[in-house]
């Protein structure tokens, strides 16, 4: 029951996390510009991974995509890649984990197969979460180190000069969404990996048994308490032999008529 709960909770947490990673990747507010008093109008500028926007004091908002890759910093491309890899891995992980859920029966799928799938999806969630956290952190580092706020390289040409607008950028909402979502996906992945251990416990042979004389003859079959791994024929964890043979812990627990001669 605990295993099913852990697995189910891990799935739900990862699902929320991956939804958050997708939301963060699509959001425009990765970096936001402090309300900058442009002489013309108060301009609020914010940027995402795919486009940048400007909102005027009048409420007018305009967004445009980055039409060229050439003018974009390499770090932005790296962040894009990390977030996309995170989404893809997370999506595959979700797909795998659906079939791995203990509460869902698909054909005659054995517990060992479900355990393997749970572990696979768990690892995928962990990597997905790490990708998202890494992507968001790289972008945040760009802001902290004033990546584009450094002294503008002004150059003159036939049309005068061009410069990058010197404005102060702060962390946008998408960064916080990304960090939280990445963390949730990571936690969900860890929970799936923990659940995997419960789904397929290690094979245990209780070999230390004491024998007592029994009134009726029985045929002893070794490995009576073999834990189920899905590979053996005893898949229901039933005692194969239960006629007078007890584990060491059970000896002298219940006196019987055979103990006294």
């Amino acid at each position: 029951m605990a295993v099913t709960a852990c697995q189910g909770l891990g799935f739900v947490v990862s699902l929320i996390g991956i939804a958050g990673i997708i939301a963060a990747t699509c959001m425009d507010q990765w970096s936001t510009q402090d309300l900058y008093n442009n002489p013309v109008t108060a301009v609020f500028n914010y940027q995402g991974l795919w486009r940048s926007c400007v909102r005027e004091s009048s409420g007018f908002t305009e967004c445009r995509g980055y039409f060229t890759l050439l003018g974009l910093p390499a770090m932005l491309q790296a962040v894009r890649a990390l977030m996309i890899v995170g989404i893809v891995l997370g999506a595959i992980g979700l797909l795998v984990s659906i079939f791995a859920l203990k509460c869902i029966r698909i054909g005659s799928m054995e517990d060992s197969a479900k355990a393997n799938m749970t572990l696979t999806s768990g690892i995928m969630f962990i990597v997905s979460g790490l990708c998202a956290i890494a992507g968001v952190s790289v972008f945040a580092n760009m802001l902290v180190t004033n990546f584009w706020m450094s002294t503008a390289n002004m150059y003159t040409g036939m049309g005068g000069m061009v410069q990058t607008v010197q404005t102060r950028y702060t962390f946008g909402a998408a960064l916080f969404v990304g960090w939280v979502a990445g963390g949730l996906t990571l936690i969900g992945g860890v929970m799936m990996c923990i659940a995997c251990r419960g789904l397929a416990p290690e094979e245990t042979n209780y070999k230390a048994v004491s024998y007592h004389a029994s009134g009726h003859s029985v045929a002893y079959k070794p490995g009576g308490f073999k834990a189920s791994t899905g590979f053996g024929s005893n898949t229901k964890n039933k005692k194969i032999y239960d006629g007078g043979a007890r584990t060491e812990d059970e000896v002298q627990s219940y006196p019987s008529k055979h103990d006294y001669v």
Partner: nanobody
């Protein structure tokens, strides 16, 4: 390559009028913020007038009621109509385009300037 080329400057008597033009190439004249700035001899850059993509228009207090900013999207040109000119309006006038959207780096483009001299 982005180019902003100002024209229309010259010598004018006090109370006269001039119309400055800023022809843009490589950039949309309906950019996020288009503006006129001026720099009087021995002084710093001063904002004159500007308009935004959203239609907001603003003027410096010193030119309100005398100057009018406009743009012609079909010609990709920004204009500054200057009436009732005074001696203190003598300066080099610069055209400026600030781009925030469609670029990861907000950019500010400047023309080479056109000289306006108000003198009797």
């Amino acid at each position: 390559q982005v180019q902003l080329v100002e024209s229309g400057g010259g010598l004018v008597q006090p109370g006269g009028s001039l119309r400055l033009s800023c022809a843009a190439s490589g950039v949309d004249i309906s950019s996020d913020v288009m503006a006129w700035y001026r720099q009087a001899p021995g002084k710093g850059l001063e904002f004159v007038s500007g308009l935004t993509r959203g239609g907001s228009i603003n003027y410096a207090d010193s030119v309100k009621g005398r100057f009018t900013i406009s743009r012609d999207n079909s010609k990709n040109t920004l204009y500054l109509q200057m009436n009732s000119l005074r001696a203190e309006d003598t300066a080099v006038y610069y055209c400026n385009a600030e781009i925030y959207t469609g670029t990861f780096y907000p950019r500010s483009y400047w023309g080479q300037g056109t000289l306006v001299t108000v003198s009797s």
